[in-house]
Each structure stands twice: as structure tokens, then as C-alpha cells.
């Protein structure tokens, strides 16, 4: 899919008034400096393209996030604000139905969440110059 | 404008299945999860559960996980809820509920008129 | 499972009255994921105010909501006819999604 054409102010907006609240009740008890941020993305639709690959694509180690509340506020958003997102999603859900456990919060989940955290902040940031 | 219209009140059988529909207008169907939720008379609100029609992705109240199923038709944009082995307990108003985002926070923010379901033999 | 139990379970209140409504949570949630319904007999629920404060379209500015973590509240600063009412907190933090038991308010 491609997110060029998304509003990113309102998924934006939807970010920082719930889904990275929800972010932050699944790192609960985990210290911010123990995951160094690995993954990166260079503007707003890579950033996009990014979190969607991690919040739903299942990885070894951990399974599937797609369950999870803040998983579940980000395809809504995504859905909402990226015109055609909804019909670009059906095999990848049909896929992962047969894997999915919910709240197994595995350390490669936490570390996973983590690096979404990240590529959401430079979400946030389209202006500044990659690292 | 955003609409939710549910079918009609329905008298059903102990053990008996019945199929309740919510037909929506005014967004778009696909990119938006639908609800249920279930009043007794005289009681309080109970999530059953929630149905994503873009890819048919559900998610139940483990209470309702073998009592509803959820379903969805995009060429009708209308969700489905059937609720199987009716006993008494199961007599209730059943609402549809839109989820979105207000104010950019979560919530169910447009509901149906609810169907009233009652079983009785 | 998240409860949420709302107090008192029912009320009455005379016009012009200042009126407060309870939501206490069982274990700590974020202000944006704790929502308020109006539902009037014979009625669908409508929303009343999302994320602890916001009010939904059309909610008149005589009520207000606050909170956090385990405890929340609606308020009317003075109770109309048109206030009685049964209002339910609900919570969006985590699965299964759960209501308080609602609170009736009567007028007097």
C-alpha cells in the first residue's frame, strides 16, 4: 500500500491523543533506555509503511500485535485517513487469523512495541533531517 | 449523514438461532469496526463483541465467544450478529454501534435504534 | 476484565442542583480511553463525552468530565429536566470493553 496519500495530520493527531497512550500501557514496567531503536524511516509515508509492517506482520518471536488495543486504534486510523487502506488488507488478516494468541507479551514483543514507539515520534517529525 | 438501521424486533424459540442485521449509511463501510452490545431489561450495557469489515477481523467478549457470531457484507455495508441456542437469559435489546475517532480519542460514536429480541416458548 | 463502577446507582436532583457523577476503575487507565453515554428510556445510548472531557456534538456546556488513572467523574453545574438521564462510563483501554453499571438521575 502506499501511504502518500494519508492525512497525516489527523492519523497524527490520533497518534498523540490515544494510540501512543495505548503504546505506553503495553511498555508499562519496562525502562525506556533498555531497547536501542534499530528500524528507521525517512518521511511520513515510509514512516507508515514501517509501522504497518510491524504492528501486523508477524516476526519471529513475536507472533502477532495485531490484537492489541493500540494495533486495533491504528488500523482504524489508517482505515479512516489513508484512502483504499481497508481493501488492501484482506489477505494479510486472513493469513494471520489462524496464528494469533493474544497477551503473550513476549520480550521480542516488547522490543518490537519499542521500535514502533520510535518510528511514531519520527512520525511526528517529518521535518527533521534523518539521522 | 451517518445512519444505523436495525432490523425489527424478533420473538424466537428456547434453542432456536436468530440473525439480527444493522444496515449502515453515510461513511465508508470498510474502514470502520462495528459493534454489539447487549441490554437486559432494567440492566446495564455489555459488550459482545466487534467486527472490522474491511477484512472481517473479529473480536469477542469471551462471555459471547460461543453464544454470537459476527458478520459483515460489504456489498450491503450491513454487519450481522447471530446469536445461537437462545435461552431466556439471552432476551435483551441488541444495539449496533459505529467506532471511530471524535475529538481524535476512540469511542463508539453512532449506535442503532437496537432490536429487541425475546425468547419465549 | 477492566471494572468500572459507577456511584451512586441512582439519584434525583432538583433543578439548578450541582450533580456529580462517579466512575471508579479497577486498574489505572489513560484519561483518552474513558468515555460517557447518555441513554434515555426506550432509547439508544448517545455519546456524551469522549476522553474524560470532550463533549460530544450538541451536549449542552453545563456538563464537564474529568479524571485519571482509577477514578473519573461527570458533573452537571446545575441539573436540568432535560438532564435525567441514565449515564454509563465505558472504558477503551482493553479487551473485553466494559461499562459501569450506569447511574440513574432523577428529577426532583
Known amino acids: 500500500y502506499d501511504f502518500t496519500n494519508c492525512d497525516f495530520e489527523k492519523i497524527k493527531a490520533a497518534y498523540l491523543s490515544t494510540i501512543s497512550k495505548d503504546l505506553i500501557t503495553y511498555m508499562s514496567g519496562t525502562k525506556s533506555t533498555e531497547f536501542n531503536n534499530t528500524v528507521s524511516c525517512s518521511n511520513r509515508p515510509h514512516c507508515l509503511t514501517e509501522i504497518q509492517s510491524l504492528t501486523f506482520n508477524p516476526t519471529a518471536g513475536c507472533a502477532s500485535l495485531a490484537k492489541e488495543m493500540f494495533a486495533m486504534k491504528t488500523k482504524a486510523a489508517l482505515a479512516i485517513w489513508c484512502p483504499g487502506y481497508s481493501e488492501t488488507q484482506i489477505n494479510a488478516t486472513q493469513a494471520m487469523k489462524k496464528r494469533r494468541k493474544r497477551k503473550v507479551t513476549t520480550n521480542k514483543c516488547l522490543e518490537q512495541v519499542s521500535q514502533l514507539q520510535g518510528l511514531w515520534r519520527r512520525f511526528n517529525r517529518p521535518l527533521l533531517k534523518q539521522q | 449523514q451517518v445512519q444505523l438501521q436495525q432490523s425489527g424486533a424478533d420473538l424466537v424459540r428456547p434453542g432456536s438461532s436468530v440473525k439480527i442485521s444493522c444496515k449502515t449509511s453515510g461513511f465508508a463501510f470498510s474502514s470502520y469496526y462495528m459493534n454489539w452490545v447487549k441490554q437486559r431489561p432494567g440492566q446495564g450495557l455489555e459488550w459482545i463483541g466487534q467486527i472490522y469489515p474491511g477484512d472481517g477481523e473479529t473480536n469477542y467478549n469471551g462471555k459471547f465467544k460461543d453464544k454470537a457470531t459476527l458478520t459483515a457484507d460489504k456489498s450491503s455495508s450491513t454487519v450481522y450478529m447471530q446469536l445461537s441456542s437462545l435461552t431466556s437469559e439471552d432476551s435483551a435489546v441488541y444495539f449496533c454501534?459505529?467506532?471511530?475517532?471524535?475529538?481524535?480519542?476512540?469511542?463508539?460514536?453512532?449506535w442503532g435504534q437496537g432490536t429487541s429480541v425475546t425468547v419465549s416458548s | 476484565e477492566i471494572v468500572l463502577t459507577q456511584s451512586p446507582a441512582l439519584m434525583a436532583a432538583s433543578p439548578g442542583e450541582k450533580v456529580t457523577i462517579i466512575c471508579s476503575v479497577s486498574?489505572?487507565?489513560?484519561?483518552?480511553?474513558l468515555h460517557w453515554y447518555q441513554q434515555k428510556s426506550e432509547t439508544s445510548p448517545k455519546p456524551w463525552i469522549y476522553g474524560t472531557s470532550n463533549l460530544a456534538s450538541g451536549v449542552p456546556v453545563r456538563f464537564s468530565g474529568s479524571g485519571s488513572g482509577t477514578s473519573y467523574s461527570l458533573t452537571i453545574s446545575s441539573m436540568e429536566a432535560e438532564d435525567a438521564a441514565t449515564y454509563y462510563c465505558?472504558?477503551?483501554?482493553?479487551?473485553?470493553?466494559?461499562f459501569g453499571s450506569g447511574t440513574k438521575l432523577e428529577i426532583k
Open positions: 465505558q472504558q477503551w483501554s482493553s479487551f473485553p470493553l466494559t
Open positions: 454501534a459505529r467506532a471511530g475517532y471524535s475529538d481524535y480519542v476512540y469511542a463508539m460514536d453512532y
Open positions: 486498574s489505572s487507565i489513560t484519561s483518552s480511553n
